[in-house]
Interface confidence: low
């Protein structure tokens, strides 16, 4: 009696299952009690000897490429051996590498978590993912795994993480890079500082007083609101960041507390109050303002 090993599919792709069948064309296995064993190179596979003429391999990998055969043994201990069959496992090269961010869009708040997700549309086997940052492509991390996606995490984003990133995927056919992704780190405004600027050391009635408000940190655009006591004087925008000024023509009613507020949509901060008082110096004919 002759024995044949049949692999289905005969040219498997990595990660896919394969069924090995030990066939006896001129003998029904029911005619006699047989035990079957499957081998790769010199090693027995699966459970070793079994009454089933089939062996299911859940997933084949590139390293499973090799020479396979089977043996059948009767109760009388006669052993039949099949010819060797070469099974070549086909690796699919990585293709269509992309880099995505979580949160989406690449905009992240300072201090928040950023995840750079590298994905391939296809590719089998062990895929090495590498993440790169910055002017010369500094390697941040590499991961090798049997999956189509991998993640690189920055647990707490800093201002210095605002850069361009890309990833590379590779599974033995040469590196395949993704496109570049820009990360914007959004920074809430710091507490602004209010400065009063007058044209002379002692401002007089009808002088123009400049209220200058500036938050030293914060992503633009920043909107500044100016207050006298709790009354809103007006607002000014700083589209590119930095400070903003509000001009006021002084009258005697302008004594009191001044403050400003900075808001860039990520939170608002109010400055400390600055007090202005009108004083009448001895021998002077006009009122003067001091802060």
């Amino acid at each position: 009696a002759e024995l044949f090993l049949i692999a289905s599919p005969s040219h498997p792709t990595e990660g896919s299952p394969v069924t090995l069948t030990c066939k006896m064309p001129f003998l029904q296995s029911s005619d006699a009690q047989f035990q079957f064993c499957f081998f790769r190179d010199t090693r027995a596979l699966g459970p070793g000897w079994s009454s089933s003429p089939k062996l299911q391999i859940a997933a084949m990998w590139k390293e499973d490429t090799g020479s396979y055969w089977c043996e059948a043994q009767t109760m009388a201990s006669k052993v039949l051996r099949s010819r060797r069959s070469q099974i070549n496992v086909h690796r699919v090269p990585v293709a269509d590498v992309s880099l995505e961010t979580q949160p989406p869009g690449g905009q992240v708040m300072e201090g928040d978590r950023l995840v750079l997700i590298c994905s391939v549309a296809m590719g089998t086997g062990d895929i090495t993912f590498l993440w790169y940052k910055g002017a010369v492509g500094l390697n941040l991390q590499s991961k090798t795994q049997r999956s189509l996606t991998a993640e690189y995490e920055i647990p707490s984003v800093r201002e210095s993480d605002a850069e361009q990133y890309y990833c590379v995927a590779e599974n033995g056919y040469g590196p395949s890079p993704s496109g570049l992704v820009s990360i914007t780190v959004r920074i809430p405004v710091s507490r602004p500082i209010l400065m009063l600027r007058a044209p002379r050391a002692q401002a007089a009635v009808e002088d123009v007083l400049e209220l200058h408000c500036e938050a030293l940190r914060g992503s633009p655009p920043i909107l500044y609101w100016f207050y006298h006591e709790d009354i809103t004087l007006g607002s000014r925008s700083a589209p590119s960041g930095g400070g903003a000024s509000f001009n006021l023509s002084l009258t005697e009613e302008h004594s009191g507390n001044y403050s400003c507020e900075a808001n860039n949509g990520l939170g608002a901060q109010r400055s400390e109050a600055v007090t202005l008082n009108f004083t009448v110096p001895t021998g002077a004919r006009s009122n003067h303002l001091t802060s």
Partner: antibody, heavy 117, light 112 residues
Framework: QVQLVQSGAEVKKPGASVKVSCKAS????????MHWVKQAPGQGLEWIGR????????KYNEKFKSKATITVDKSTSTAYMELSSLRSEDTAVYYC??????????WGQGTLVTVSS | DIVMTQSPDSLAVSLGERATINCKSS????????????LAWYQQKPGQPPKLLIY???TRESGVPDRFSGSGSGTDFTLTISSLQAEDVAVYYC????????FGQGTKVEIK
Amino acid sequence: QVQLVQSGAEVKKPGASVKVSCKASGYTFTRYWMHWVKQAPGQGLEWIGRIDPNSGGSKYNEKFKSKATITVDKSTSTAYMELSSLRSEDTAVYYCTRVNSGAMDYWGQGTLVTVSS
Amino acid sequence: DIVMTQSPDSLAVSLGERATINCKSSQSLLYSSNQKNYLAWYQQKPGQPPKLLIYWASTRESGVPDRFSGSGSGTDFTLTISSLQAEDVAVYYCQQYSNYPTFGQGTKVEIK
């Protein structure tokens, strides 16, 4: 195969400008940064700056900030470097070079710029 | 800027003998998150552009003969040509890419 082909040698007078081109082929142009390197006669290698062809964003060696301007044309996969206010010390071979994971893996053949009155 | 210093400036070695070039950086090129050194070695022959030999301090670029090897970590690095061939006569440069690129001044290798 990857190729970087640069424009031919140039002779310029002091004070003039020159624009050197570098045409890339054999790879996806927007996926790799392009750098420019200067080599004066008999001297070593000096980094000028780089450009990200995807966004057009560039960075320069402080020394070349007011000397070199690097640009790209994505439609033709070409990088350019313009040198302004040329002086005799700008006489050199200028190379474009692709950067892959930090190292400069492919180089153009070089363009000799001679500044002479 | 990171300053790269090569030694010696020139080197004369007999055919088949070992050639060793040293490179020292003014600050560490070892990136702690991946334990890689951001250093490359290049070979330049007269009238030709530089050619990448080694990157990550010790990884040989494809197609580069295995007589070329790179070693070292942190601030001290070495390029070794185990058995010098006539075609190895050239100037060799180290380059850091931990920051904006800077090169060593070059080492000229000749046959003794």
